[in-house]
Amino acid sequence: MAVTACQGLGFVVSLIGIAGIIAATCMDQWSTQDLYNNPVTAVFNYQGLWRSCVRESSGFTECRGYFTLLGLPAMLQAVRALMIVGIVLGAIGLLVSIFALKCIRIGSMEDSAKANMTLTSGIMFIVSGLCAIAGVSVFANMLVTNFWMSTANMYTGMGGMVQTVQTRYTFGAALFVGWVAGGLTLIGGVMMCIACRGLAPEETNYKAVSYHASGHSVAYKPGGFKASTGFGSNTKNKKIYDGGARTEDEVQSYPSKHDYV
């Protein structure tokens, strides 16, 4: 039950996170005009990954796309790439995790397969979240650098008689959305990886070996106890020795790599 809850919660958290990453990527407010200690302009500038916008005092907003690819800063291209990779990995992760959900039955899919898929989606979510966090952080760093450069320009000589308005940009809403969304996707991925441990067949069972002592018939069965995973007892998945007779196929199980995650 706890494994199902962990997996389900991981899926939901990742879903919200990826929706947030998509939203952040599409948002125009990655950087917004800094209004503090600046000339008060009758226009408000803000920029996204794909276009820059200007809102006039009337509320009229005009946006212009970055129609050049080669003319854009390499950092911006890198941020775009990181966000897109994050979205793609997240989307694939979501697709995989839907089939991995314990509450969803697909044919006769074994728990080991579901565990594999859960782990795969978890790793994808982790990488997706890291991509988003990295992308947003790179952009934020770029903003901070440009901010202090433009501040320096603002307070040094203009060189000529004519002054130009130095528009400084600060963090926009999309950065915060991206950081939070990336964090959620990361947390969701970690939860999926944890859930995977509970889904995996936990025991390495061996064929029962009978030792016949003279006079008494006592069966000794090794490997019947294993430490708790911390997610409660999962009676549905664990093979519990009931001492009853069983076929060779029932008893035989192989160690899985998930036992050691």
């Epitope: 226009v43 500038n45 803000y46 916008c53 200007v54 009229f60 212009r64 004519v162």
Partner: antibody, heavy 119, light 113 residues
């Protein structure tokens, strides 16, 4: 038809106060920023103040800052200019102007009301 | 504050001739975000309030005859009347609508020669 009608002008002594009003019709007043612009007799135009549609942004010319207060009542479709500590140089025709939708332009102007500051 | 300087102060042009009024700002009125210049031109006829002619330095307000055109960028702007008509006699003002306080030029009086 867009109409802006100023009122409240008149003769006032230096140091006195006056409140100008502007009644508007013909457009959704609450959606537009509004300006006050003045013109001294025989002189050029001087921008006085601006108030945004939701009153979040208010700006003044340096010459009137601290003495004039712009306000609006969207329910009454009215714009106001409270003028205190009036000086002789405040003598002018005061225009109520709508802020245009494009280019921060001043697109519709009232006929103006004359304010004379004299002893 | 941005200082707007118009030249000439007055101008006499024959009917049908081209009239050119210049406006210079002490700071650039160009906004890189949307590649627009925030300069507006107005026409004021005697005894009337001003009338909007051109915004964004070159975009004609609806209803304004196409003989009026605006040009320029950054700090230097021009209002051109391609073929002067009798009804164009007025004072013309340019205005900074980019940075508060918004400022007007001193005006250019256009007369018929």
């Amino acid at each position: 038809e867009v109409q802006l009608v100023e009122s409240g002008g008149g003769l006032v002594q230096p140091g006195g106060s006056l409140r100008l009003s502007c009644a508007v019709s013909g457009f959704t007043f609450s959606s537009f920023g509004m300006h006050w612009v003045r013109q001294a007799p025989g002189k050029g135009l001087e921008w006085v103040a601006y108030i945004s549609s939701g009153t979040t942004n208010i700006y003044y010319a340096d010459s009137v800052k601290g003495r004039f207060t712009v306000s609006r009542d969207n329910a009454k479709n009215s714009l106001y200019l409270q003028m205190n500590s009036l000086r002789a140089e405040d003598t002018a025709v005061y225009y109520c102007v709508r802020s245009g939708y494009y280019g921060n332009s001043l697109d519709y102007w009232g006929q103006g009301t004359l304010v004379t500051v004299s002893s | 504050d941005i200082v707007m300087t118009q030249s000439p102060d007055s101008l006499a042009v024959s009917l049908g001739e081209r009239a050119t009024i210049n406006c210079k700002s002490s700071q650039s009125l160009f906004n890189s975000g949307n590649q627009r210049n925030y300069l507006t031109w107005y026409q004021q006829k005697p005894g009337q309030p001003p009338k909007l002619l051109i915004y964004w330095a070159s975009t004609r307000e609806s209803g304004v005859p196409d003989r009026f055109s605006g040009s320029g960028s950054g700090t230097d702007f021009t209002l051109t009347i391609s073929s002067l008509q009798a009804e164009d006699v007025a004072v013309y003002y340019c205005q900074n609508v980019y940075i508060y306080p918004l400022t007007f030029g001193q005006g250019t009086k256009l007369e018929i020669k």
